[in-house]
């Protein structure tokens, strides 16, 4: 086989997804390794090829894009699972090539199971809230691109095992969860579940994050307060953007 620029296994992108949920995974080549995007590559006559190696196997296999109900599909530079299965776990490779050029990268995908209270081996992003500092919000993360804006999903928020309802200072507002005044008792894991219809089927997206309420330090200034509104995503959680 011809020489191919092999970026190896990108272990910085330890992608974890829940079993039986949709997942959209962008080829990392265009995000981290190449200086051009998919559209440019496609216009230049380059083809994006996907294949994978199952967990505990060495054999590279093509991905089966002819499964019932198009369970796995490719759209531009995104690999779609609608939905995932436990045995989709493995190392996935995207290769960009034509007759004169070749570049590829692999990344691990782990399909994980959650329990009845949303606990799982998933690595959770942490969102800091400042104690007793006005209204602060967290947003259900990594749900962009799953459904068009014409689709109106339903969103259910949980703290630990329990639906958030009739809480004194925590109010679900669609994709956002508002903390009227953050207290130490608000520390914990928060889960949003987004439910949406697609082609006569119902899909669910489960996203859990850890809220950490920290003391405010006036000397840090307003800049830190604005920074607190942003979710501190671990590097491996950038895969949906």
């Amino acid at each position: 086989s011809e020489r191919c620029d092999d970026w190896g296994l990108d272990t910085m992108r330890q992608i974890q997804v829940f079993e039986d949920e949709p997942a959209r995974i962008k080829c990392p080549l265009f995000e981290h390794f190449l200086k051009f995007n998919y559209s440019t590559a496609h216009s230049a006559g380059l083809t994006l090829i996907w294949y994978w190696t199952r967990q505990d196997r060495d054999l590279e296999e093509p991905i089966n894009f002819r499964l019932p109900e198009n369970r796995i599909s490719k759209e531009k530079d995104v690999l779609w699972f609608r939905p995932t299965l436990l045995n989709d776990t493995g190392n996935y490779t995207c290769m960009l090539r034509n007759t004169t050029y070749c570049s590829k990268v692999a990344f691990p995908l782990e399909v994980v199971q959650k329990d009845s209270c949303f606990n799982s081996p998933m690595k959770l992003p942490v969102h800091k809230l400042y104690i007793e500092y006005g209204i602060q919000r967290i947003t259900c993360p990594n749900v962009d691109g799953y459904f068009p804006s014409s689709v109106k999903p339903t969103i259910t928020w949980y703290m630990g095992c329990y639906k958030i309802q009739n809480f004194n200072n925590v109010i679900p507002e669609g994709m956002n969860l508002s903390f009227l005044i953050a207290l130490i008792s608000n520390n914990g894991n928060y889960t949003c579940v987004v439910t949406y219809p697609e082609n006569g089927r119902t899909f669910h997206l489960t996203r859990t994050l850890t809220v950490k309420v920290v003391g405010s330090d006036i000397s840090r200034g307003l800049n830190d307060i604005f920074e607190a509104q942003k979710i501190e995503w671990h590097e491996h959680h950038h895969h949906h953007h």
Epitope: E19, D20, P83, Q113, S116, Q165, N166, V193, T195, H204
Partner: antibody
């Protein structure tokens, strides 16, 4: 597509037990709740309880606590509902209903249990 | 337990009519309300979840609304295949509880 296939009709004596099965396919059995709902002849729907096969967590309606047992076999993707100390008023159609969250998205075809001496 | 009261218990309407069924909870249920359709001799089917979310594959003539303790299911233009009994169900607080049902017939 999601399918829930329940076991066949049963005729039982008062005081005995019945075990109804619900075989699931077309979704990840371990990752959804399995509910059990019953409907007496000509009556409405009555929720009995639910189980999360992934970890075995169960919730029961107070009315059935101690008399109903919900179990799940992940290896065969089958859920079971056992009701003991049967009485005539337990005569009903028993349904299993799957829900990723709390709504019961899909239902089995129902199992008629007749309690008669 | 939360009590769910449905009204009317039965109704008869003509094809094309707008049909409204109401459901009242004994306490606030924060929009955690489902509607199910059950045709004679069949298992129930989920129509609407979380007050207004149309379940996949359900015709758009069905809609839901409400808040607090009072909720409504509307069929904008009744069709012959809509003959069934409709149940509301709260899932705010365990145990989940159903309304008594509304039987819909064609005149």
């Amino acid at each position: 597509q999601v399918q829930l296939v329940q076991s066949g009709a049963e005729v039982k004596k008062p005081g005995s037990s019945v075990k109804v099965s619900c075989k699931a396919s077309g979704y990840a059995f371990s990752s959804s709740w399995m509910n059990w709902v019953r409907q007496a002849p000509g009556q409405g729907l009555e929720w009995m309880g639910r189980i999360y096969p992934g970890d075995g967590n169960t919730h029961y309606a107070q009315k059935f606590q101690g008399r109903v047992t919900l179990t799940a076999d992940k290896s065969t993707s089958t859920a079971y509902m056992e009701l003991s100390s049967l009485r005539s008023e337990d005569t009903a159609v028993y349904y299993c209903g799957e829900g990723y969250l709390d709504p019961m998205d899909y239902w089995g075809q129902g199992t008629l249990v007749t309690v008669s001496s | 337990d939360i009590q769910m009261t449905q009204s009317p218990s039965s109704l008869s309407a003509s094809v094309g009519d707008r049909v409204t069924i109401t459901c009242s909870a004994s306490q606030g249920i924060n929009n955690y309300l489902n509607w199910y359709q059950q045709k004679p001799g069949k298992a129930p089917k989920l129509l609407i979840h979380y007050t207004s979310g149309l379940h996949a594959g359900v015709p758009s003539r069905f809609s839901g609304s409400g808040s607090g303790t009072d909720y409504t299911l509307t069929i904008s233009s009744l069709q012959p295949e809509d003959v069934a009994t409709y149940y509301c169900q709260q899932y705010s607080i365990l145990p989940w509880t159903f309304g008594g049902g509304t039987k819909v017939e064609i005149k």
